[in-house]
Interface confidence: low
């Protein structure tokens, strides 16, 4: 057993048929000595007296929060959530696994550049009673301080007859260095509570490899006179790295058809502009990428030939 | 050239060397997120690598006031790196496919590093750990874990050589 | 117990410029996103600009962009709004709104208000 | 002018029971939680309930919110005098990617 937070605590456990459970001792936080009476939750039955009660944790019917009392008037609360293990795994019930880019992968995060800012994300079909915590640093063995957010609702979508909820939390590390080269990963720990289920969800990486920067912007197009081709322009997203000098990213800029069938015209460049040629109903799309380090394409930034 | 007495370097040569370097890196290991490496209890092997680090001076403004220091550092790394993609990790079995670009990235390094020291210029350079895995196996995934580190060492590079080349150059 | 408390509001010409201030208190402000939400006289709500924890990402309303920017500056527990080229479709009570959590929705607690009058 | 559909008043007595509706799209109410705010005259509004229906501290549960498809409403039981004021629904809104609002219900407790 530990403790999560002030007066709840997590019992870990084996969890297989007739499995015997872990003896937990409670103590009740006061100057009491006599007259101390324990019940759970909203029941009034009495489970035991004394200062200290204690109990077989099995099942989450055991699990809850556990009150003592002395003359009616309550003296302290023990919230006990219940971990468990299930062939040596820990269960990963509450949330969904992304199979992103690999199996197992809960938690996915991205950042827009090198500044030491990241978002993560996680889904979960479970819409009440949920809570989660957030932590993170850079490195494990002399963490370096990176600070989260609370984790807030993000998205509900439907998904065949189920709800999906996306929860996301946005995190800072504190003393980034965006020019440096990454040695230590950062570590995200999420702590996930549903109803008095446990769980946590860990996810390691470097800034470097979950960049995706924003799409480019203001795409424009410039007709070139007597010809079919036109020059396309864009510049940087305003979320990027700066100097553009020094946080360089490439272009891949694309002619597509109407028809999605339609053979599509790609150019790489490394430039803020390119020349093509555009036909009729088609549209030209410009996506960016670390010119340098490849992490993944920004979204596309499209506008239409005509 | 960078040389140690303090000179500038060729920055738009430095330039598209490290662009080419960052190219063949990414084209001698493409498998980005197939295999955490991170996963496979590596501390020791990849620890001792050279890294660009907050204090070197390869930002912007460290580059602005004095870029030896940065040059220095990555004068370091290249030859470390250059160091270990000659050794048996890389010459040892199961053999590089015959177009590999291993050693075009091998024989890359060494001509940035040239650039940056010529020939009767010394800068301090780094150990190499001796690392020598016997089973052929873990030379593989050792192989892996130093492509990807180089990477992230070149990437650096190539952002100090692009600045320098747009900012620094006479 | 959270408060917001908005200031900077007042009389200003067609094309002139004002800046809103709101201090925080109560709560961790660099945990939180931030959003300005206005209403017209006599009509409804509408949602203008929002900044998230760290100030990093901003996002406005098209009937602002470019004219509006919204700031935080986590040191001094206060979101900013700065306002450029005002018109009198901008007159209104600006009300600044935390998000619950560190996105920018829902809004779970506002601020007094403060009055633009744009006007010449 | 806004993306969600109020109708503009409601009225109700003391003691009965009054609905207020909220119309949207896919795009907001169908996808996204709803969020209603309570704004008393004169004053700022107030989070009534969110995630559809739930309800922060301190507002009592006479008021319940409730979502199906792409419309929203809003129940007050045991109308009181207290409860006269504009109720305003709200949704994340995924096209847009910022919240949008109703034009709000003017409630008149007779």
């Known amino acids: 057993i530990w403790e999560l937070k002030k007066d709840v605590y997590v019992v870990e456990l084996d969890w297989y048929p007739d499995a015997p459970g872990e003896m937990v001792v409670l103590t009740c936080d006061t100057p009491e000595e006599d007259g101390i009476t324990w019940t759970l939750d909203q029941s009034s039955e009495v489970l035991g007296s004394g200062k200290t009660l204690t109990i077989q944790v099995k099942e989450f019917g055991d699990a809850g929060q556990y009150t003592c009392h002395k003359g009616g008037e309550v003296l302290s609360h023990s919230l006990l959530l219940l971990h468990k293990k299930e062939d040596g795994i820990w269960s990963t019930d509450i949330l969904k696994d992304q199979k992103e880019p690999k199996n197992k992968t809960f938690l996915r995060c991205e950042a827009k550049n090198y500044s030491g800012r990241f978002t993560c994300w996680w889904l979960t079909t479970i819409s009440t009673d949920l809570t989660f915590s957030v932590k993170s640093s850079r490195g494990s063995s002399d963490p370096q301080g990176v600070t989260c957010g609370a984790a807030t609702l993000s998205a509900e979508r439907v998904r065949g007859d189920n709800k999906e909820y996306e929860y996301s939390v946005e995190c800072q590390e504190d003393s980034a260095c965006p020019a440096a080269e990454e040695s230590l990963p950062i570590e995200v720990m999420v702590d996930a509570v549903h109803k008095l289920k446990y769980e946590n969800y860990t996810s390691s990486f470097f800034i470097r490899d979950i960049i995706k920067p924003d799409p480019p912007k203001n795409l424009q197009l410039k007709p070139l006179k007597n010809s079919r081709q036109v020059e396309v322009s864009w510049e940087y997203p305003d979320t990027w790295s700066t100097p553009h000098s020094y946080f360089s990213l490439t272009f891949c800029v694309q002619v597509q058809g109407k028809s999605k069938r339609e053979k599509k015209d790609r150019v790489f460049t490394d430039k803020t502009s390119a020349t093509v040629i555009c036909r009729k109903n088609a549209s030209i799309s410009v996506r960016a990428q670390d010119r340098y380090y490849s992490s993944s394409w920004s979204e596309w930034a499209s506008v239409p030939c005509s | 050239r960078a040389v140690p007495g303090g000179s500038s370097p060729a920055w738009t040569q430095c330039q598209q060397l490290s662009q080419k370097l960052c190219t063949l890196a990414w084209s001698a290991h493409p498998l980005v997120g197939h295999m955490d490496l991170r996963e496979e209890g590596d501390e020791e092997t990849t620890n001792d690598v050279p890294h660009i680090q907050c204090g070197d001076g390869c930002d912007p403004q460290g580059l602005r006031d004095n870029s030896q220091f940065c040059l220095q550092r990555i004068h370091q790394g290249l030859i470390f790196y250059e160091k270990l993609l000659g050794s048996d990790i890389f010459t040892g079995e199961p053999s590089l496919l015959p177009d590999s670009p291993v050693g075009q990235l091998h024989a890359s390094l060494l001509g940035l590093s040239q650039l940056l020291q010529p020939e009767g210029h010394h800068w301090e350079t780094q150990q190499i750990p001796s690392l020598s895995p016997s089973q052929p196996w873990q030379r593989l995934l050792l192989r892996f874990k130093i492509l990807r580190s180089l990477q992230a060492f070149v990437a650096v590079a190539a952002r100090v050589f692009a600045h320098g080349a747009a900012t620094l150059s006479p | 117990e959270v408060q917001l408390l908005e200031s900077g509001g007042g009389l200003v010409q067609p094309g002139g410029s004002l800046r809103l201030s709101c201090a925080a208190s109560g709560f961790t402000f660099s945990n939180y996103g931030m959003s300005w939400v206005r209403q017209a006289p006599g009509k409804g709500l509408e949602w203008v600009s929002r900044i998230w924890p760290s100030g990093g990402y901003t996002k406005y309303a098209d009937s602002v962009k470019g004219r509006f920017t919204i700031s935080r500056d986590n040191s001094k527990n206060t979101l900013y709004l700065q306002m450029n080229s005002l018109r009198a479709e901008d007159t209104a009570v600006y009300y600044c709104?935390?998000?619950?959590?560190?996105?920018?929705?829902?809004?779970?607690?506002w601020g007094q208000g403060t009055l633009v009058t744009v006007s010449s | 002018q806004y993306e969600l559909t109020q109708p503009p008043s409601a009225s109700g007595t003391p003691g009965q029971r009054v609905t207020i509706s909220c119309s949207g799209s896919?795009?907001?109410?169908?996808?996204?939680?709803v969020t209603w705010y309570q704004q008393l005259p004169g004053t700022a509004p107030k989070l009534l309930s969110y995630t559809n229906n739930q309800r922060p501290s301190g507002v009592p549960d006479r008021f319940s919110a409730s979502k199906s498809g792409t419309s929203a409403s809003l129940a007050i039981s045991g109308l009181q005098s207290e409860d006269e004021a504009d109720y305003y629904c709200a949704a994340w809104d995924d096209n847009l990617n910022c919240p949008v609002f109703g034009g709000g219900t003017k409630l008149t407790v007779l």
């Open positions: 896919s795009s907001n109410i169908g996808s996204n939680f």
């Open positions: 709104a935390r998000g619950k959590g560190s996105g920018s929705f829902p809004l779970d607690y």
